[in-house]
């Protein structure tokens, strides 16, 4: 293609001039907060024994936390780009309250789970520009999530430790599996 | 201002070694993903690897083994260790910042050859 003028053919190609496409930026992201993560969860590891518990499910039964299932069409078999995409957008705004309570969660770390939330507000955004049946996406209510916040807050001491640890070992799974599936679209 | 300043590329006989670093300016380093984009004349441009802020790393499936990419935080750079180097390794490579809030940087680039 010619050369636009006051163009130097040289930059037209030049990977300086050209921002990171969609997908790129997604993948980027996915990543960004995923490293976040591993970074929260060491500390977490690292104040208790909850990454050895085998009291779980204990803590389980007052979360709700977003997974991938079969029908979300995430998996290879029976992969659905449109249906999985809703899937990961849904999820992840399902995730958003959970966020909310890791702040102040960590002492060392406050500035990292701050930033874990953050970035997937903006993955949020990517990818509801990327998402065609908008729709389809179902928003958490404000009033459920306050009331879930205000219980999570007022568990023990040991619950609240295992709910974080619960948040991150879910929220990293859910994001694994949203970059599996994305990397196919 | 943001600035990305990638050290000279050069030329290298294959099989040979070449470390790349980039020192930035203007960001906030320590928050921001680092990485190494390549392309190779008429080809697409490519991610060869980058860093995350806690270390996470992600390479090219080209690259894995022979290539390794590390950030000095308290220096402001971001370095591409490059051994064992193949022809097909020939390209431009662009060090590529990129924040939590999706604000990415490019540097200008530097011709890194392989050839006998």
């Known amino acids: 293609a010619p050369v636009p003028p006051g163009e130097d053919s040289k930059d037209v190609a030049a990977p300086h001039r050209q921002p990171l496409t969609s997908s790129e930026r997604i993948d980027k992201q996915i990543r960004y907060i995923l490293d976040g993560i591993s970074a929260l969860r060491k500390e977490t590891c690292n104040k208790s024994n909850m990454c050895e518990s085998s009291k779980e499910a204990l803590a389980e039964n007052n979360l709700n936390l977003p997974k991938m299932a079969e029908k979300d069409g995430c998996f290879q078999s029976g992969f659905n780009e449109e249906t999985c995409l809703v899937k990961i957008i849904t999820g992840l705004l399902e995730f958003e309250v959970y966020l909310e309570y890791l702040q102040n969660r960590f002492e060392s770390s406050e500035e990292q789970a701050r930033a874990v939330q953050m970035s997937t507000k903006v993955l949020i955004q990517f990818l509801q520009k990327k998402a065609k049946n908008l729709d389809a996406i179902t928003t958490p209510d404000p009033t459920t999530n306050a009331s879930l916040l205000t219980k999570l807050q007022a568990q023990n001491q040991w619950l609240q430790d295992m709910t974080t640890h619960l948040i991150l070992r879910s929220f990293k799974e859910f994001l694994q599996s949203s970059l599996r599936a994305l990397r196919q679209m | 201002q943001v600035q990305l300043v990638e050290s000279a590329g050069g030329l290298v006989q294959p099989g040979g070694s070449l470390r790349l670093s980039c020192a930035a300016s203007g960001i906030i380093f320590s928050i921001n993903a680092m990485g190494w984009y390549r392309q190779a004349p008429g080809k697409r441009r490519e991610l060869v690897a980058d860093i995350m802020p806690y270390g996470s790393t992600e390479y090219a499936d080209s690259v894995k083994g022979r290539f390794t990419i590390s950030r000095d935080n308290a220096k402001n750079t971001v370095y591409l260790q490059m051994n064992s180097l193949k022809p097909e390794d020939t390209a431009v490579y662009y060090c590529?910042?990129?924040?939590?809030?999706?604000?990415?940087?490019w540097g200008q680039g530097t011709q890194v050859t392989v050839s006998s």
């Open positions: 590529h910042s990129y924040d939590p809030r999706g604000d990415d940087y």
